[in-house]
Interface confidence: low
């Protein structure tokens, strides 16, 4: 069974998938549709890199632009470096400015909902 066939079988269960499963799926040529991606747990999506999301969505990655103001896409964008987002060529805005350091302060993030940034 290849990635696409596997994805069809598990699609209905994906809403609660942890980050590890999403990372694994991103390596399997599944081309997840945007409707499924939008139902994923925000906390599972946030740790994914731009490259992983690009692989996970395949051609559907273009849909991120249409969904950039909605969760989980909005929150995921806030966690990405802007120059990484720029590689998608979709004009996604709101990433971490170039030259900033991201401190993974879990308590700060839990309280504010955004990562802590240190300026250049």
């Amino acid at each position: 069974m290849n990635g696409s066939e596997y994805f069809v079988k598990i699609q209905s269960f994906l809403g609660g998938a942890p980050t590890e499963d999403l990372k694994a799926l991103s390596q399997q040529n599944v081309s997840m549709d945007l409707a499924t991606f939008m139902k994923l747990r925000t906390d599972a999506v946030l740790p994914l890199t731009v490259a992983e999301v690009q692989k996970l969505l395949g051609p559907h990655v273009e849909g991120l632009k249409a969904e950039e103001r909605h969760r989980p896409v909005r929150d995921w964008i806030l966690r990405q470096r802007q120059d990484d987002l720029d590689t998608l060529g979709l004009g996604l805005q709101g990433g971490i400015p170039n030259g900033y350091l991201v401190l993974d302060l879990s308590m700060q993030e839990a309280l504010s909902g955004t990562p802590c940034l240190l300026g250049p």
Epitope: G58, E62, L90
Partner: antibody
């Protein structure tokens, strides 16, 4: 409502170039990628490529990478496709088509007919 | 490139009939397939996306099915306005590719 208005028919000589347009209305132009599709008379559809919403990124079908050049003008909500070094094989109807997030081509232009003839 | 094969170039039918158009992919696509209807001199119109989801405003007599490599478009109770050409399209991988089309004709 979403509308994609394409420019009129083109008659061109072999070796020449043509540039056609696709003017978008009824939605935020910079939100959706614009794709281009070729259809030769009595034949199927071929995907040429797309240009990103902001116009700074293009992806081409390898078959068309030396034939088509995609650009946009955000100020006029218009996408353009230029075809170069025309031959009779390029005689076709060319469609612009907007992707929709979950449906690939929900919206199409009416097509631009290109005829290459000596 | 993924090849989408519509083995029947033409299909004959009568008003009121049920007809099934088939499309076979050269590799598994999950459900990343759409179907379009095209009438002479017109742009294609999407009927089905994600293999089986009817697009807004499309009559219930159109139904899509299949996953993996084999896909179908079924029209029940064919109407005269359904006489057109039907194309399948995959959007699992670039380059996006279409079937060659199946033209529905009156018997």
């Amino acid at each position: 409502q979403v509308q994609l208005q394409q420019s009129g028919a083109e008659l061109a000589r072999p070796g020449a170039s043509v540039k056609m347009s696709c003017k978008a209305s009824g939605y935020t132009f910079t939100t959706y990628t614009m794709h281009w599709v070729k259809q030769r008379p009595g034949q199927g559809l071929e995907w040429i490529g797309y240009i990103s919403p902001t116009g700074d990124f293009t992806k081409y079908n390898q078959k068309f990478k030396d034939k088509a050049t995609l650009t946009t003008d955000k100020s006029s909500n218009t996408a353009f496709m230029q075809l170069s070094s025309l031959t009779s094989e390029d005689s076709a109807v060319y469609y612009c088509a907007r992707w929709n997030g979950t449906v690939w081509f929900a919206y199409w232009g009416q097509g631009t007919l290109v005829t290459v003839s000596a | 490139d993924i090849v989408m094969t519509q083995s029947q170039k033409f299909m004959s039918t009568s008003v009121g009939d049920r007809v099934t158009v088939t499309c076979k992919a050269s590799q598994a696509l999950g459900t990343n397939v759409a179907w379009y209807q095209q009438k002479p001199g017109q742009s294609p119109k999407v009927l089905i996306y994600s293999a089986s989801y009817r697009y807004s405003g499309v009559p219930y007599r159109f139904a899509g099915g299949g996953s993996g490599t084999d896909f179908t478009l079924t029209i029940t109770n064919v109407q005269s306005e359904d006489l057109a050409e039907y194309f399948c399209q995959q959007y699992n991988n670039y380059p996006l590719t279409f079937g060659a089309g199946t033209k529905l004709e009156l018997k």
